[in-house]
């Protein structure tokens, strides 16, 4: 039950951390005009790692891609990569943990196969989150800087860079949003590979099981006699009921006629 | 046809208070950023207040600020300035205009003014 | 506050000549965001409310007669009328857009000679 809660659980956190990577790498607010010098400007500019925008007084919003990839600080475009490599790998992540989740069975699936799934998409996660963290603290390190100018300066007139009066820029939503995100996908595929431990099937030591020959009164010890006992092939990945009360957890689930009604 | 009509104005004493209201028509008020401009007897143009579509962000000249309040009413499609404390030097023609959504913050439509009065 | 300063005060021109009229801004009012500058002139007739007849400091208001020219950037600006008219006899005057308040310059003048 402990470990379905886990990976259920990493799996929703992960989830609403992804969404928040993607919010976040959408949005258009990384970074904020600075108000501080000038609280009364009618004119609010702000930039996203895709397009820069101004919100006017007057209520209108007009916004500004980047077209061009050679124009933009390298700086900008690790951002990008690193958003967009935290957003894919959490997206093969979810893919994986979907399959890999207690709850869903799949065919005959093995608890091993689970278990390596689990695994391998809370690294994934885990991954993901370090990117979008990563991501974000490289932008909010640029603008704290000040490296970070206004790129639609850096490309205007005759590929001259424009001297005026340079706008300061501050941390945006998207910064935190990111952070946010970032971590509870980091969390998420921590919990995952928490599950992952639980969900792996153990080579534990058997209890012995009492084998009642014809005519002699001999206990056997499961394996001894492969041939004609059959437990030493059915018996590696099984646990042997003894009767006593088990955990949901502790008993591993396999497909049976019933399974598939 | 945009259309602003200014009422409300007349002669007043100095502390004393008066509420003038802009009936808009012809667009969706409700979109617009509204202002309230003066203009003096000599004939300079003062900036006096502005309340944006929503009503959320409302912005005032210092020599104003926290003696004149603006407002709207979407529903009514109205503007309104609410002056209290006059003084002498508010004595003005004041102009409804409305921003330009795409005018760059340019007022692109006035109404016709209303007098504004303050002596003893 | 940002200071508009016209010049000049008042301007005589004959029918038919360019008139120019000046107007600088103590700030700086271009936007770097979208490399606009925020600057409106406005034309005032006796009797009526101002009328916009450039925004952006050089973008013409639609049904605005295209002798009417703006220009400039940052601080500097000017209005220009290629060929005056006689109905071009009026006050005009500059805003700042960019930052409240949303000061006017004092405004020119403007005359047939």
């Known amino acids: 039950m402990a470990v379905t809660a886990c990976q259920g659980l990493g799996f929703v956190v992960s989830l609403i951390g992804i969404a928040g990577i993607i919010a976040a790498t959408c949005m258009d607010q990384w970074s904020t005009q600075d108000l501080y010098n000038n609280p009364v400007t009618a004119v609010f500019n702000y930039q996203g790692l895709w397009r820069s925008c101004v919100r006017e007084s007057s209520g209108f919003t007009e916004c500004r891609g980047y077209f061009t990839l050679l124009g933009l600080p390298a700086m900008l475009q690790a951002v990008r990569a690193l958003m967009i490599v935290g957003i894919v790998l959490g997206a093969i992540g979810l893919l994986v943990s979907i399959f890999a989740l207690k709850c869903i069975r799949i065919g005959s699936m093995e608890d091993s196969a689970k278990a390596n799934m689990t695994l391998t998409s809370g690294i994934m996660f885990i991954v993901s989150g370090l990117c979008a963290i990563a991501g974000v603290s490289v932008f909010a390190n640029m603008l704290v800087t000040n490296f970070w100018m206004s790129t639609a300066n850096m490309y205007t007139g005759m590929g001259g860079m424009v001297q005026t009066v340079q706008t300061r820029y501050t941390f945006g939503a998207a910064l935190f949003v990111g952070w946010v995100a970032g971590g509870l996908t980091l969390i998420g595929g921590v919990m995952m590979c928490i599950a992952c431990r639980g969900l792996a099937p153990e080579e534990t030591n058997y209890k012995a099981v009492s084998y009642h020959a014809s005519g002699h009164s001999v206990a056997y010890k499961p394996g001894g006699f492969k041939a004609s006992t059959g437990f030493g092939s059915n018996t590696k990945n099984k646990k042997i009921y003894d009767g006593g009360a088990r955990t949901e957890d502790e008993v591993q689930s396999y497909p049976s006629k019933h399974d598939y009604v | 046809e945009v259309q602003l009509v200014e009422s409300g104005g007349g002669l007043v004493k100095p502390g004393g208070s008066l509420r003038l209201s802009c009936a808009a028509s012809?667009?969706?008020?409700?979109?617009?950023?509204m202002s309230w401009v003066r203009q003096t007897p000599e004939k300079r143009l003062e900036w006096v207040a502005t309340?944006?579509?929503?009503?959320?962000?409302?912005y005032y000249l210092d020599s104003v600020k926290g003696r004149f309040t603006i407002s709207r009413d979407n529903a009514k499609n109205t503007l309104y300035l609410q002056m209290n404390s006059l003084r002498a030097e508010d004595t003005a023609l004041y102009y409804c205009?409305?921003?330009?959504?795409?005018?760059?913050?340019?007022?692109?439509?006035w109404g016709q003014g209303t007098l504004i009065t303050v002596s003893s | 506050d940002i200071v508009m300063t016209q010049s000049p005060d008042s301007l005589a021109v004959s029918l038919g000549e360019r008139a120019t009229i000046n107007c600088k801004s103590s700030q700086s009012l271009f936007n770097s965001g979208n490399q606009k500058n925020y600057l409106a002139w406005y034309q005032q007739k006796p009797g009526q409310p101002p009328k916009l007849l450039i925004y952006g400091a050089s973008t013409r208001e639609s049904g605005v007669p295209d002798r009417f020219t703006g220009s400039g950037f940052g601080t500097d600006f000017t209005l220009t009328i290629s060929s005056l008219q006689a109905e071009d006899v009026a006050v005009y005057y500059c805003?700042?857009?960019?930052?409240?308040?949303?000061?006017f310059g004092a405004g020119t003048k403007l005359e047939i000679k």
């Open positions: 205009a409305r921003m330009g959504l795409t005018q760059r913050n340019a007022l692109d439509y």
């Open positions: 805003q700042n857009d960019h930052t409240y308040p949303l000061t």
């Open positions: 012809g667009f969706t008020f409700s979109t617009y950023t």
């Open positions: 309340i944006v579509g929503g009503g959320g962000y409302t």
